[in-house]
Structures are given as structure tokens and as C-alpha cells.
Interface confidence: low
């Protein structure tokens, strides 16, 4: 296509020769600026036309000869003014105009829809100097016309700061329908309408379109350019192009899949990530999405363990990240787990189920009815308590984790003692006399410690008192009590 | 071809609100995700949350809860964010770009970016 | 959250030069996951390489990505001017969505 500037043209001079008037008197170029490329257009377009000179836009010199004769009104000749020619097809056309030979220097330029033209590949300016004019001749070619050719071309030449404009030349480059706007491919609901649009441009206008659907034309009379095709509803995936005819024939688009928005697959390779006490984080990978983007999932465990009731636990989550964490799980349990997808047409299939575990944890609650008395005759303090619920263990019992603190004037000191799971009692030495005894207990699985009872308290006198009664684990509300016997 | 074109520059006073806009052409609006991402001057990037068109469904990061809503029209192909009780930590550029949802989330277009300044 | 951590922040570089960013996540996160950006000074940013070395459309071919795991990297085989910009990381797999806090290149 022509490059366009903005820049000046650099003048040819008018005479190149040695002086005005040269001897050179035939119509044979004095000066000619050949054509870069050195190709003979395919169509040419001859310089001049008989008749009257072309008065649209003239410049009349003021300066006058020896005999004060005014010169001629200046202008471009007639030329032709409307070029059609075919896409890749070269073309050559000029416009010509003679000049006083009193005019020292001058510029021709060739300008294309209001911007100059620069690029001397296109340009071939021709100068024939005679006694009194030099007729110059500015040809303009293009090796191969593209679209981007067409336009409104014209010359331009500066005199005595007078602008001289020829006529313009109208080129027009036809050549194959160009498409401005082809289908998309969408996906769409089942039995839903929707529309396709296709825009196709000439020259030549008027470009016709035939719209196809899996390889049968749809329409049997063409719609003009533009043309929206309303498909009322589809049932099954399907290809839909348009063709675009003008006198120069036919352009079909680019073919576009229509898909059928469908649920989506189950997901794929459901996997357990970690495991602890009461969670499992599981991943997934989705299915295929049903040409409609993925939104929720969700996430159905069952306990696997067959004296279970059988319910399913439901957990919801965002499509993204294909992660999750359930929670709330009991520990040293075995689970059945299932990932189903929805998009908006619906839910997929639940995934092939898996089986996960949880890990032992650390027992939830601490054991119940811790009692506490003093067995004065072997200065021993007795701890009774009971299990924790099965349930609430969390695991295998290993043992029990006993806090004892004794408190007396000034003096404050905490035991630890671990002692095994089978039993349900613990005997400790009196530490301190004359001082209180605070006791708590946490059961212990291979998971962890669980959480202490709550503290109960026995005053341990001097030597010499008769008889001791057991401090309980205190009813809700009795805070702190001491019980001195 | 795919187009996101985002309102003008906004100056706020602290406190009040503001509600920027993202207009989406060249695809099927309600089928692609809209997301918002904030880029404080000469810092990085920072996801906002995205809003699906066909139904509404939002999603934000935790810090946006509550400064931020995600709306869309979907009869002019429009998304909107609200920025409510706004302070100089929201002045930024806040760019929308389409969310590519297939199972591994990108942004395949970008708006322009619409310049937030927050001053009294 | 999954944090991207980016090095280096800055780069001085030639042009011809062969140029590598990394990624590093906090967490393993899927190579389907990890996608590159490039910004230019007061332009949005644009989708560089997705799914970890899937060129974009119109992204030249001397930019390749790599990684797997936790660790990623972007690389321009030869630099050019026009690639002086800040290159971001981002990381589709967890909410929310997070980006790396990016590479600047600059020339020499």
C-alpha cells in the first residue's frame, strides 16, 4: 500500500539543463525520474485528454513578457477520474500541466484522501521543455492495488505561492468479499435461541450472504451484508460459517463450533491431601465442564464404618481451588467421600467414591468425677475419676496426665505424674502438710494430651487430725471450694 | 475483538463512596467471569474479587469484604464496583479483566484502569 | 493464602542479553496453575504465559516459561528495548487469587 508523510517533497528543478530555452527541442524527456522497481503497469493511463485545460483551481502569473502579453491561467489538464480495477492488478495514471518557462523551479506533489504522498517507488515525474513551456507530466503507480489503495488521489503544484490542484482521480480497488465481522463460537442452552452475525464488505457492493450450518446452506435467498442469523434452538453441537458473494465471487468465513451447554463430568481423581483428628483435605480434578464455567461443588462423606446410621454429611464449596478441607470429622474413623460439580445447567454425577481415615487425636474431654481424699495413715492422697466417653477419646487411651500443686504459706509447687490407661485410681505422697492440694487429670492418646478437669482441692492439715472426707469434682457453679475436714 | 473499556478518572473525599465501571464487546459478556484487581501507585497487583454476570455469583479476598461490591448490568454488558467509606489506603489504579475460568484461573484481557485518588 | 515471592525485584540489563525471573510459592501449586504478565509503564497489564509456558497470542517466541513444585521462572532468550516492563507472577489454584510482587527490567 502507498506510504503516507507529512514531509516536503524535495523540488525538481525545471531546467535541469544549462539554460532556459535549451537546445533540446523534440518531446523527448529532458529529465526523467524512472520508476524504481522497473515493472511495466498492467493498466496506463494516457497523460493528457484533448479539450479545454482543466480551471477548477488556477494560478494567473502577474509577471508579463517583453511585449506585456499576460500569460495563460495555470492549470492541471483533464485526466481520467475514475479507475476500477481488481484486487493485485498494477496501475499506473498521471496528470500533466505545462508551465511558463519563466518559472525557474517548481514542486509537484501527489496527495491521497487529503495527506501527501512521499515514496519515489511511486512517483515518476517528466519534464518536455519547448521555446516558451515545459510540459510536465507526474505519473504515480502501484505495483499490486490492495483495499487500502482506494481512495481520491490528486496533484498539487506550488507557483509564485499559488496552489495549483488537479482534479481528482478516483480509484477503486474491487476484488473478493472482506469479512468485518465473522461468527463466534459460543455455547449455548439446549433449545435456546440465539443469534450469529456476519458483516462483509465489497467493493463491488453489494455482497450477498449465504449462511451454512453443518455443511447445508440455511438460508435459500441471501440476506445483504450485514446479516444476523437467529437459530431458534440447537440440540446437538453444530458448525455454522457464511458466505460472502459480490460480482467477484465468494469468501467463506472462518467455520465456528456452536456446543451445547451440558452438566457437567464427574470429577476426576479425588485424593487425600492430609489427615488429621478431625479433618481430611481432599483435591480433585474437575471434569469436563459441560461447556458452561463450574461454580459450586460439593463435597458428600458417609461413614464407612457399617454399624453407622448411614447419613451423609454435605459440605459445600467454590469450584476454586479444587481443595478442601472437612471438618468436624470424629477421629479414628474411616469415611466414604464423593466430589460432585454443578455449572449452571446442573449438578455432575458424584465422583468415584474414595475411602479416607482420620488420624488419633488428642481426646476431646477430660475425665469425669475426679474425686479426691486423704488417706492420713499412709500419708497418701487418693484420686478416683472415670473414663472419658469411647467417643470423646479420640483415639486409643495410652494413660492419664495427673497435676497436682500444693499450696501453703509461701510455698507453691507443681507435680506431673503419667500413669497408665487401665486403671481408674492414683495414689500420690503427701507433699506438704499444713497446705492445699489442687488436682486435675487429662486423659492421653497417642494423639496428644486432652484438656484437664476441672480443679479440685483438699486441705492436707498438720499431723494429728481423725478423719478425712473426699473432695468431689465441684457440681456447676460451686467454684473453687476447699473442703477441710 | 475483545474489548474491556473502563470509566474515567475518579478524585473522592475521604468517607464517601465511589462506583467505577467496566464495560465489556467482543464476547458473550454473561459466559466470562469479571475481576477487579488493584495496583496502588508503584506497587504490584492485588485481586479484588471477581463476579460471574449470568447469576451474580461474587467472590472476594477477605480484606475486600465490605469495601468492595461487585455488581453487573448485564443488559449493557457492564460491571460495576462500588468502593464504600473511602480513605487515602484506596487511592490506586483499579483494573477489571476477564477471568479465562478453565479449572487453572487467568486474566486473558485487562481494561485500561480507571485512577482513584482519595483526597480532601 | 499461597504467596509468590519474586526475584529480582529490580534488573539492569543489555539488549541481547538472556534474561530469568523467578517465581517461588509458598505451597506446591499444579504448573496448570502459574501464569505470567507484563506490564509497561502506564499500561494495564497483559497476559504473557499461561498454564507455566504456553506463550500468549502475539507473545514473541524469545519469551519460554518453566517450573513445577514450588519454584517457576520466566525467560527472555535475547532482550529487546521494547521489553523493558515489570513481569508479574500469578497463581490460579487457591482463593484468593494472588500475583507475585513483581520484576522490574530495566535497560543499562
Known amino acids: 500500500a502507498i506510504t503516507e508523510a507529512r514531509e516536503e517533497a524535495k523540488p525538481y528543478p525545471l531546467f535541469p539543463g544549462p539554460f532556459p530555452g535549451s537546445l533540446q527541442t523534440d518531446h523527448t524527456p529532458l529529465l526523467s525520474l524512472p520508476h524504481a522497481s522497473g515493472y511495466q503497469p498492467a493498466l496506463m493511463f494516457s497523460p493528457t485528454q484533448p479539450g479545454r485545460p482543466h480551471t477548477g483551481n488556477v494560478a494567473i502569473p502577474q509577471v508579463t513578457s517583453v511585449e506585456s502579453k499576460p500569460l495563460p491561467p495555470l492549470a492541471f489538464k483533464h485526466t481520467v477520474g475514475h479507475i476500477i480495477l481488481s484486487e493485485h492488478k498494477g496501475v499506473k495514471f498521471n496528470c500533466s500541466i505545462s508551465v511558463p518557462n519563466i518559472y525557474q523551479d517548481t514542486t509537484i506533489s501527489w496527495w491521497k484522501d487529503g495527506k501527501e504522498l512521499l515514496g519515489a517507488h511511486h512517483a515518476i515525474t517528466q519534464f518536455y521543455p519547448d521555446d516558451e513551456v515545459t510540459a510536465i507530466i507526474a505519473s504515480f503507480s502501484i505495483t499490486s492495488v490492495q483495499r487500502s489503495d482506494n481512495g481520491s488521489y490528486i496533484c498539487k503544484m506550488k507557483i509564485n505561492n499559488e496552489e495549483i490542484v488537479s482534479d481528482p482521480i478516483y480509484i477503486e480497488v474491487q476484488g473478493l468479499p472482506h469479512f468485518t465481522k465473522q461468527p463466534e463460537s459460543m455455547n449455548v442452552t439446549r433449545n435456546t435461541a440465539f443469534n450469529l452475525t456476519c458483516q462483509a464488505v465489497g467493493p463491488p457492493e453489494p455482497v450477498n450472504i449465504f449462511w451454512v450450518q453443518n455443511s447445508s446452506r440455511v438460508n435459500e435467498q441471501p440476506e445483504k451484508s450485514p446479516s444476523v442469523l437467529t437459530v431458534p434452538g440447537l440440540t446437538e453441537m453444530a458448525v455454522f460459517s457464511c458466505e460472502a458473494h459480490n460480482d467477484k465471487g465468494l469468501t467463506v468465513s472462518k467455520g465456528v463450533q456452536i456446543n451445547i451447554k451440558a452438566i457437567p463430568s464427574p470429577p476426576t481423581e479425588v485424593s487425600i491431601r492430609n489427615s488429621t483428628a478431625h479433618s481430611i483435605l481432599i483435591s480433585w480434578v474437575p471434569g469436563f465442564d459441560g461447556y458452561s464455567p463450574f461454580r459450586n461443588c460439593s463435597i458428600q462423606v458417609k461413614e464407612a464404618d457399617p454399624l453407622s446410621n448411614g447419613s451423609v454429611m454435605i459440605f459445600n464449596t467454590s469450584a476454586l481451588p479444587h481443595l478442601y478441607q472437612i471438618k468436624q470429622l470424629q477421629a479414628l474413623a474411616n469415611y466414604s467421600i464423593g466430589v460432585s460439580c454443578m455449572n449452571e445447567i446442573g449438578w455432575s454425577a458424584v465422583s468415584p467414591w474414595i475411602l479416607a481415615s482420620t488420624t488419633e487425636g488428642a481426646p476431646s474431654v477430660a475425665p469425669l468425677n475426679v474425686t479426691v481424699f486423704l488417706n492420713e495413715s499412709s500419708d497418701n492422697v487418693d484420686i478416683r475419676w472415670m473414663k472419658p466417653p469411647t467417643k470423646q477419646q479420640d483415639g486409643e487411651l495410652v494413660g492419664y496426665r495427673i497435676s497436682h500443686v500444693w499450696q501453703s504459706a509461701g510455698i507453691s509447687k507443681e507435680l506431673l505424674e503419667e500413669v497408665g490407661q487401665n486403671g481408674s485410681r492414683a495414689r500420690i505422697s503427701v507433699q506438704v502438710h499444713n497446705a492445699t492440694c489442687t488436682v486435675r487429670i487429662a486423659a492421653v492418646t497417642r494423639g496428644g494430651v486432652g484438656p484437664f478437669s476441672d480443679p479440685v482441692k483438699i486441705f492436707i492439715p498438720a499431723h494429728g487430725w481423725v478423719d478425712y472426707a473426699p473432695s468431689s469434682t465441684p457440681a456447676p457453679g460451686n467454684a473453687d471450694p476447699v473442703l477441710i475436714i | 475483538q475483545v474489548q474491556l473499556q473502563q470509566s474515567g478518572p475518579e478524585l473522592v473525599k475521604p468517607g464517601a463512596s465511589v462506583k467505577l465501571s467496566c464495560k465489556a464487546s467482543?464476547?458473550?459478556?454473561?459466559?466470562?467471569?469479571i475481576n477487579w484487581v488493584k495496583q496502588r501507585p508503584g506497587q504490584g497487583l492485588e485481586w479484588i474479587g471477581w463476579?460471574?454476570?449470568?447469576?451474580?455469583?461474587?467472590k472476594y479476598k477477605e480484606k475486600f469484604k465490605g469495601k468492595a461490591t461487585l455488581t453487573v448490568d448485564t443488559s449493557s454488558s457492564t460491571a460495576y464496583m462500588e468502593l464504600h467509606s473511602l480513605t487515602s489506603e484506596d487511592s490506586a489504579v483499579y483494573f477489571c479483566?476477564?477471568?479465562?475460568?478453565?479449572?487453572?484461573?487467568?486474566?486473558?484481557?485487562w481494561g485500561q484502569g480507571t485512577t482513584l485518588t482519595v483526597s480532601s | 493464602e499461597i504467596v509468590l515471592t519474586q526475584s529480582p525485584t529490580t534488573m539492569a540489563t543489555s539488549p541481547g542479553e538472556k534474561i530469568t525471573i523467578t517465581c517461588s510459592a509458598s505451597?506446591?501449586?499444579?504448573?496448570?496453575?502459574l501464569h505470567w504478565y507484563q506490564q509497561k509503564p502506564g499500561f494495564s497489564p497483559k497476559l504473557l504465559i499461561y498454564?507455566?509456558?504456553n506463550l500468549a497470542s502475539g507473545v514473541p517466541d524469545r519469551f519460554s516459561g518453566s517450573g513445577s513444585g514450588t519454584s517457576y521462572s520466566l525467560t527472555i532468550g535475547t532482550m529487546e528495548a521494547e521489553d523493558v516492563a515489570t513481569y508479574y507472577c500469578?497463581?490460579?489454584?487457591?482463593?484468593?487469587?494472588?500475583f507475585g510482587a513483581g520484576t522490574k527490567l530495566e535497560l543499562k
Open positions: 467482543g464476547y458473550t459478556f454473561t459466559s466470562y467471569d
Open positions: 498454564r507455566t509456558s
Open positions: 463476579i460471574y454476570p449470568r447469576d451474580g455469583y461474587t
Open positions: 479483566a476477564r477471568g479465562f475460568y478453565s479449572n487453572l484461573y487467568y486474566f486473558d484481557y
Open positions: 505451597s506446591s501449586i499444579s504448573s496448570n496453575y
Open positions: 500469578q497463581q490460579g489454584r487457591s482463593i484468593p487469587l494472588t
